[in-house]
């Protein structure tokens, strides 16, 4: 069908609550494009009827709510005037107790589930709530160890919990809760966050934390396009470089002639006391020679790798 396949990393979600995923893929979605969502390679698009539990809302796929059986690979097809991209998103649904933060020991959790507070500083936690405009979110409540948080050191400001003068005792398991309203119906959204406390290293000698990848392998078909993010948290005043290397060489230099594998432009989100950096690596076409090779994300003295591997053959 002439569409280029792009594989996103897994999304790990909680059953019995709303979830939404936006099919945006700069620069593909910057011009005039049409976006259509499908489930598990079905030829029938996801419904656009807003009363449907699962439906497409503009570029979003919206689950109201997510259910156990919704796990699977979803594709959004982005068609431009002279391009077509099929983005594959693997959604894994798990059962979770209302006040739980940990996700059953699943690896590679995103920065939304693991956040850092800086000792002695005024800092904040963020409740990540990604939903289309049709969803109205009510005020957020914050919990620690299943109990509502209160005290003069804690202030709720929009999607953030401000914590003044962070202490070691502020580590632990948090949850943020909001009521989402869509088409007159109300749903509860609850996100768990594991919070660790860090002391900022003196003399600017901070050690960046690579959130993703986590030294693991990624199954990918030969010939497909693959994009992998490297997510790094670091102090605001850091001078660390972030890059992708292979065989101890910058990927842009290693693949200078073919330009088949390229490093993306670094972006960052600024938090009160730290930044979250993202720099991706794009495999325009995965070749046989890429398998088994560690592609390293470097951030200052920190490193983490991915290794591409062929999917196991399906004998069904």
């Amino acid at each position: 069908d002439g569409c280029k396949d792009i594989f996103m990393k897994n999304e790990i979600l909680s059953a019995s609550q709303p979830f939404a995923f936006n099919c945006t893929f700069p620069p593909i979605t910057s011009g005039e494009v049409s976006v259509t969502w499908y489930k598990n390679s079905s030829k029938i698009p996801v419904s656009k009827i807003i009363q449907s539990r699962i439906h497409q809302d503009e570029t979003w796929i919206l689950f109201l709510p997510m259910e156990w059986g919704d796990s699977g690979v979803y594709q959004c097809v982005i068609k431009g005037r002279d391009s077509c991209h099929r983005i594959h998103v693997n959604l894994t649904v798990f059962e979770k107790h209302w006040c739980d933060t940990s996700i059953g020991g699943l690896p590679n959790l995103s920065d939304e589930y693991k956040q850092i507070l800086h000792l002695g500083k005024d800092d904040s936690l963020t409740c990540h709530l990604h939903f289309p405009k049709s969803c109205v979110l009510g005020p957020i409540k914050w919990y620690k160890d299943c109990n509502e948080i209160k005290g003069e050191r804690f202030t709720v400001l929009e999607t953030r919990l401000l914590v003044s003068n962070v202490s070691a005792e502020d580590r632990g398991n948090y949850a943020c809760q909001a009521i989402l309203t869509h088409s007159g119906k109300q749903y509860e959204v609850l996100n768990g966050i594991t919070v660790s406390i860090t002391e900022r290293a003196g003399y600017g000698g901070s050690v960046p934390k690579i959130i993703y990848p986590k030294n693991h392998s990624i199954e990918v078909q030969l010939g497909t396009t693959l994009i992998v993010d490297c997510n790094v948290t670091d102090t605001k005043d850091n001078t660390n470089l972030r890059c992708w290397r292979v065989n101890n060489t910058l990927v842009d230099d290693y693949y200078d002639e073919s330009k088949r594998i390229r490093e993306g432009v670094e972006t960052h989100v600024s938090f009160r006391e730290h930044n979250l950096y993202t720099v991706n690596i794009t495999f325009l076409e995965v070749k046989m020679e890429d398998y088994g090779l560690p592609f390293m994300c470097h951030a200052g003295v920190s490193t983490a790798y991915i290794i591409l591997q062929l999917p196991a053959p399906d004998f069904r």
Partner: antibody, heavy 116, light 107 residues
Framework: QVQLVQSGAEVKKPGASVKVSCKAS????????MNWVRQAPGQGLEWMGM????????RLAQKFKGRVTMTVDKSTSTVYMELSSLRSEDTAVYYC?????????WGQGTLVTVSS | DIQMTQSPSSLSASVGDRVTITCRAS??????LNWLQQKPGKAPKRLIY???SLDPGVPSRFSGSRSGTDYTLTISSLQPEDFATYYC?????????FGQGTKVEIK
């Protein structure tokens, strides 16, 4: 470092009341819940209830409602647990335990003996 | 109220043995479970927080895990200082409840 220091042992007669104190130091006292747990001689642990020093919100186990009062003195970072209408089966060691993270720190315990 | 059923109530073991203690919750408590150690005449001490997070200073021979509503404390190689009584504690919803305790004695 975090410390919870409890008041000394008490001997009380049946029908009387006892008030046990728990003085906290080393953390933000008004930010976290404080629990009370008791342990009868040779028995297991039993949760009695908890109080939040910020606004004195109290939650009690059903069996202690009407007999237990928990209070806070913010100026001295102290929590109090008062148990009234004492009976012999209330003889136990009473512990306070802070929920900076759930039940992270415990007081040394206060032995309350109810005897005629 | 949530019931926590702890087993065994007591066990005899030797130094170096692998010891396993189990708690079963009567309903879903997620990962809101601690393991406590208590020695005679002393206050309980938390070993494990939130099912599997080891408290600072607790030896790595202690570990916690979960399968559904069954929670396990494992001591991989019992040491002389580990002879004590162990309790599980759920804090998912009040009233918080403890297991009945497991006394680990020297064989």
């Amino acid at each position: 470092q975090v410390q919870l220091v409890q008041s000394g042992a008490e001997v009380k007669k049946p029908g009387a009341s006892v008030k046990v104190s728990c003085k906290a130091s080393g953390y933000y006292f008004t930010s976290y819940w404080m629990n009370w747990v008791r342990q009868a001689p040779g028995q297991g642990l039993e949760w009695m209830g908890m109080i939040h020093p910020y606004d004195s919100e109290t939650r009690l186990a059903q069996k202690f409602k009407g007999r237990v009062t928990m209070t806070v003195d913010k100026s001295t970072s102290t929590v109090y647990m008062e148990l009234s209408s004492l009976r012999s089966e209330d003889t136990a060691v009473y512990y306070c335990a802070s929920s900076t993270t759930a039940f992270a720190y415990w007081g040394q315990g206060t032995l309350v003996t109810v005897s005629s | 109220d949530i019931q926590m059923t702890q087993s065994p109530s007591s066990l005899s073991a030797s130094v170096g043995d692998r010891v396993t203690i189990t708690c079963r919750a009567s309903q879903d408590i997620g990962n809101a479970l601690n393991w406590l150690q208590q020695k005679p005449g002393k206050a309980p001490k938390r070993l494990i927080y939130a099912t599997s997070s080891l408290d600072p200073g607790v030896p790595s021979r202690f570990s916690g895990s979960r399968s559904g509503t069954d929670y396990t404390l494992t001591i991989s190689s019992l040491q002389p200082e580990d002879f004590a009584t162990y309790y599980c504690l759920q804090y998912a919803s009040s009233p918080y409840t403890f297991g009945q305790g497991t006394k680990v004695e020297i064989k």
